[in-house]
């Protein structure tokens, strides 16, 4: 029985209680892998996930989070509320920055600016709760007869791609 | 997939610098911040800095503050580790290690590793 | 504060349950990840913000964290599972924005 229980494909399962040995998978119901002896529920997408890839009898669906909210976890396991860019999600809720940090991200923890002065720079553009500062060329450079005719465009930060 | 290789083990003398690089591949580089991490002989893991590849925007821990430089050359992908003025307690395993594309969640990928020598 | 305290070794026989903590002041309020770090290999990220797993870890391994107090449980533990584990903490600070414990080597007994 064993031997032909290995037989049965993806999408079908071993049915010992009828004389055909495999059968394929109920409805709502998947088997990712050959010689299952049961067929897995599939997972369903409902209040804060959307279904981002139905089940098929061979593998499970997948969910997403809904507008306003971020996956977290293997396989989108839980969605988290997205803040505000310029706010970070506390255990308490969402909270503006600090003065000295930023986020531009809707999701993570406020970041402290850039030190330019640590890497030899001065700061061109100050930052925001939004945005990190933008260092420009060392103080030295910045000395009189040393800039140039015409100042850099102050450079905005754009946002990292979330994973 | 992504991928984080750095450079061969080096030997150095007291005083001295060394500069480890850490080529990604897999995702858009520019992206998603890098962080060095390193681990002395029987010690635990400590953190470095990191450095934001789209502005070259670094943090340093305060340890490491005058004596670290992390810079980036974002046509290849890479990013750099400096560290000047070697000791023998600069000994260590240097790692980069990705950021997941914001601040506050754990390192998603890492690098095999840079073993430092610092010797007379 | 920017210490975070484990124990330096915990010891399980083979299918029993290891929990390895992280203490630190007021950590229920910050988000606490944990890697596993074997000998010549790179650290390994098993749980992030306290409890989700990264695709690829075992259900087995899980994480919480209240108070003082961060936990990481491995449940029905394996030879494999014998490494050394760091939590690790970001914060808002310019001079200590990273900052890990000082590891727990899992010891598999038997």
């Known amino acids: 029985l064993q031997d032909l229980c290995s037989n049965c494909p993806a999408g079908t399962f071993c049915d010992n209680n009828r004389s055909q040995i495999c059968s394929p998978c109920p409805p709502n119901s998947f088997s990712s892998a050959g010689g299952q002896r049961t067929c897995d529920i599939c997972r369903q997408c409902k209040g804060v996930f959307k279904t981002r890839k139905e089940c098929s009898s061979t593998s499970n669906a997948e969910c997403d989070c809904i507008s306003g909210y971020h996956c977290l976890g293997a396989e989108c396991s839980m969605c988290e509320q997205d803040c505000k860019q310029g706010q970070e999600l506390t255990k308490k809720g969402c909270k503006d920055c600090c003065f000295g940090t930023f986020n531009d991200q809707k999701r993570g923890i406020c970041r402290p600016w850039t030190n330019c002065s640590l890497d030899g720079k001065s700061v061109l553009v100050n930052g925001t709760k939004e945005r990190d500062v933008v260092c420009g060329p060392s103080p030295a450079d910045l000395s009189p007869g040393a800039s140039s005719a015409t100042p850099p465009a102050p450079a905005r930060e754009p946002g990292h791609s979330p994973q | 997939q992504v991928q984080l290789v750095q450079s061969g083990a080096e030997v150095k003398k007291p005083g001295a610098s060394v500069k480890v690089s850490c080529k990604a591949s897999?995702?858009?580089?520019?992206?998603?911040?890098m962080h060095w991490v390193r681990q002395a002989p029987g010690q635990g893991l400590e953190w470095m800095g990191w450095?934001?590849?789209?502005?070259?925007?670094?943090n340093y821990a305060q340890k490491f503050q005058g004596r670290v430089t992390i810079t980036r050359d974002t046509s290849i992908s890479t990013a750099y580790m400096e560290l000047s003025r070697l000791r023998s307690d600069d000994t260590a395993v240097y790692y980069c290690?990705?950021?997941?594309?914001?601040?506050?969640?754990?390192?998603?990928?890492w690098g095999q590793g840079t073993l430092v020598t610092v010797s007379s | 504060s920017y210490v975070l305290t484990q124990p330096p070794s915990v010891s399980v026989a083979p299918g029993e349950t290891a929990r390895i903590t992280c203490g630190g002041d007021d950590i229920g309020d910050k988000r606490v990840h944990w890697y596993q770090k074997k000998p010549d290999q790179a650290p390994v990220l098993v749980v992030y913000?306290?409890?989700y797993r990264p695709s690829g870890i075992p259900e087995r391994i899980s994480g919480s964290n209240s108070g003082n107090t961060a936990t990481l449980t491995l449940s029905r533990v394996e030879a494999g599972d014998e490494a050394d584990y760091y939590c690790q903490v970001w914060y808002s600070s310019p001079d200590h924005p990273g900052v890990f414990g000082g590891g727990t080597q899992l010891i598999i007994l038997g």
């Open positions: 913000e306290d409890r």
């Open positions: 290690a990705r950021e997941p594309g914001y601040y506050g969640s754990g390192l998603d990928y």
């Open positions: 450095i934001n590849p789209n502005s070259g925007g670094t």
């Open positions: 897999g995702y858009n580089f520019s992206g998603y911040y």
